[in-house]
């Protein structure tokens, strides 16, 4: 901690300006009034303070606001935000999206730090839900943000926020997350015509059940292989060869290149070889002709 020393004559800061970069740490502590610093925080960012000097400024703000900084100060923290610990941030009450954007801008281009994660958590909890504008902002800075949330956290995302989600925002989502997001997407994209709806819902189909895939197969949707490969294996397995052919349309030829990968590999093992042969793709590994297929799950249910 910086020792309390009197400010040298004539050095008392009247405003936050460039002259302060020549102040030693103890001079900043002694000569800069914390209340002045708080009201002129917007100027700090334009001045090339050293990290050590920023430490002093942070210390002054901490003394002035032991219960946590007010939003008027937080919004103008700029690079001083990088000096904050998650414990500091937990004391804040950030309600303005502009404040959130200003702080995310400081961290732009970097991985999500613990500070940023805490800030986002505080902000979202304060709002009560992850609304569209917030989601828009967060995915713009961190495209993988949505997929970093647990299924429980995702359950608080209102369907209207789904409009802000871009396909790339879902790239790293696992099936459990898509299970939560898919029904919300259905709710969000209601009352659309078939083709328009499919374009919108396509990115979320990794959470779709078999019944929905069967229904889509009747609509000439021509699903691409990339989407098909992201479908839940348990949802794909019950589909017949005819249904997969209808679902993929002209893209069905791509199955050959994916025959060793899930879910295609597992699906092939469940089909009769005769049926697979009708595709004319040379897919191998189906159930040989003449073999009886026992559905053990059905057998268990009956017993």
């Amino acid at each position: 901690e910086v020792e309390k020393t009197a400010c040298p004559s004539g050095k008392k800061a009247r405003e936050i300006d460039e002259s302060l970069i020549f102040y030693k740490k103890w001079e900043l502590e002694a000569c800069v009034d914390a209340a002045l610093l708080a009201t002129q925080m917007d100027r700090v960012n334009a001045i090339p303070f050293t990290y050590e000097q920023l430490d002093v400024l942070k210390h002054k703000l901490d003394e002035l606001y032991p219960q946590g900084y007010p939003e008027s100060v937080i919004q103008h923290l700029g690079y001083l935000f990088l000096k904050m610990s998650p414990e500091d941030i937990r004391k804040w009450n950030v309600t303005s999206l502009e404040t959130l954007k200003a702080l995310l801008e400081v961290n732009k281009g970097h991985e999500m730090s613990p500070q940023v994660a805490t800030l986002i958590d505080r902000f979202v909890k304060g709002r009560g839900q992850l609304d569209k504008d917030t989601l828009d902002t967060l995915t713009a800075f961190y495209p993988g943000y949505l997929c970093s949330l647990s299924p429980e956290e995702l359950s608080s995302v209102p369907p209207s926020s789904i409009w802000a989600v871009r396909p790339q925002d879902l790239d790293t989502c696992d099936p459990r997350q898509l299970d939560v997001l898919y029904p919300k997407a259905r709710l969000a994209f209601q009352n659309m015509n078939g083709s328009e709806y499919f374009v919108k819902i396509q990115s979320f189909l990794g959470g779709a059940p078999t019944e929905d895939l069967k229904a889509l197969s009747q609509q000439n949707v021509s699903m691409d292989l990339a989407t098909f490969m992201k479908l839940r294996t348990d949802a794909v397995l019950p589909l017949t060869v005819a249904e997969v052919q209808k679902l993929l349309g002209p893209h069905v030829e791509g199955l050959k290149a994916e025959e060793r990968h899930r879910p295609v590999r597992d699906w092939i093992l469940r089909q009769r070889q005769d049926d697979l042969d009708t595709l004319g793709l040379g897919l191998q590994g189906g159930i040989p002709n003449g073999y009886l297929v026992l559905d053990l799950s059905m057998q268990e249910a009956l017993s």
Epitope: R186, L187, Q190, M192, Y197
Partner: antibody
């Protein structure tokens, strides 16, 4: 003819349980999302449970969450509502209602049953 | 939760005249292309029946004297000309998010 018929209502004591059924006919039941909607004695309509066509997704309002469970048996074309820890405020006419499909993606109720009456009283 | 407020609670309209029922949502329930509000009619002793879906689309089999309009938070159901069989209670419902909620109903009486 497209129709849904509810059954299983009756008089039950507070804290008790009841299971409602809804038999569907005249449409491809397994393709449709379904809901239960109730009407209180004061004639207010309240949505109480939703289930997706395959049964994988269910939703409830906070008033019944943890007490009511919606389920379906697509092989039997039947929708269920298991109601536990019943309260006097659950007294209502319970309607089974059809919603949309994965393709005809709508979220209004276009087919309603005649309802089954549930009275919770000591 | 979104609150759907209907007005008036009841109204009496002469045969052949216009009945206007309002429904106000506590927040916007519209996108740029669609409004997620639906209207139902309930005749005495019967279950509700869908009339209008997505604010202005007439359900199949519903007479053209029923019409719906509105967007954002304010929605209207119009019946013109009113007929004897239109006696009953009318409800609005939103499908914007879970939970779906209904208006408290407007009772229509034909004079």
């Amino acid at each position: 003819e497209v129709q849904v018929v509810e059954s299983g209502g009756g008089l039950v004591k507070p804290g008790g349980s009841l299971k409602l059924s809804c038999a569907a006919s005249g449409f491809a039941f397994s393709s449709y999302d379904m809901s239960w909607v109730r009407q209180t004695p004061e004639k207010r309509l309240e949505w109480v449970a939703y289930i997706s066509s395959g049964g994988g997704s269910t939703y409830y309002p906070d008033t019944v969450k943890g007490r009511f469970t919606i389920s379906r048996d697509n092989a039997k074309n039947t929708l269920y509502l298991q109601m536990n820890s019943l309260k006097s405020e659950d007294t209502a006419m319970y309607y089974c209602a059809r919603q949309g499909t994965a393709v005809k993606n709508y979220w209004y109720f276009d087919v309603w049953g005649a309802g089954t009456s549930v009275t919770v009283s000591s | 939760d979104i609150v759907m407020t209907q007005s008036p609670a009841s109204l009496a309209v002469s045969l052949g005249q216009r009945a206007t029922i309002s429904c106000r949502a506590s927040q916007s329930v519209s996108t740029s292309s669609s409004s997620y509000v639906h209207w139902y009619q309930q005749r005495p002793g019967q279950p509700p029946k869908l009339l209008i879906k997505y604010a202005s689309n007439l359900e199949s089999g519903v007479p053209a004297r029923f019409s719906g309009s509105g967007s954002g938070t304010d929605f209207t159901l119009n019946i013109h000309p009113v007929e004897e069989e239109d006696t009953g209670t009318y409800y609005c419902q939103h499908s914007w998010e879970i939970p779906f909620t209904f208006g408290s109903g407007t009772k229509l009486e034909i004079k």
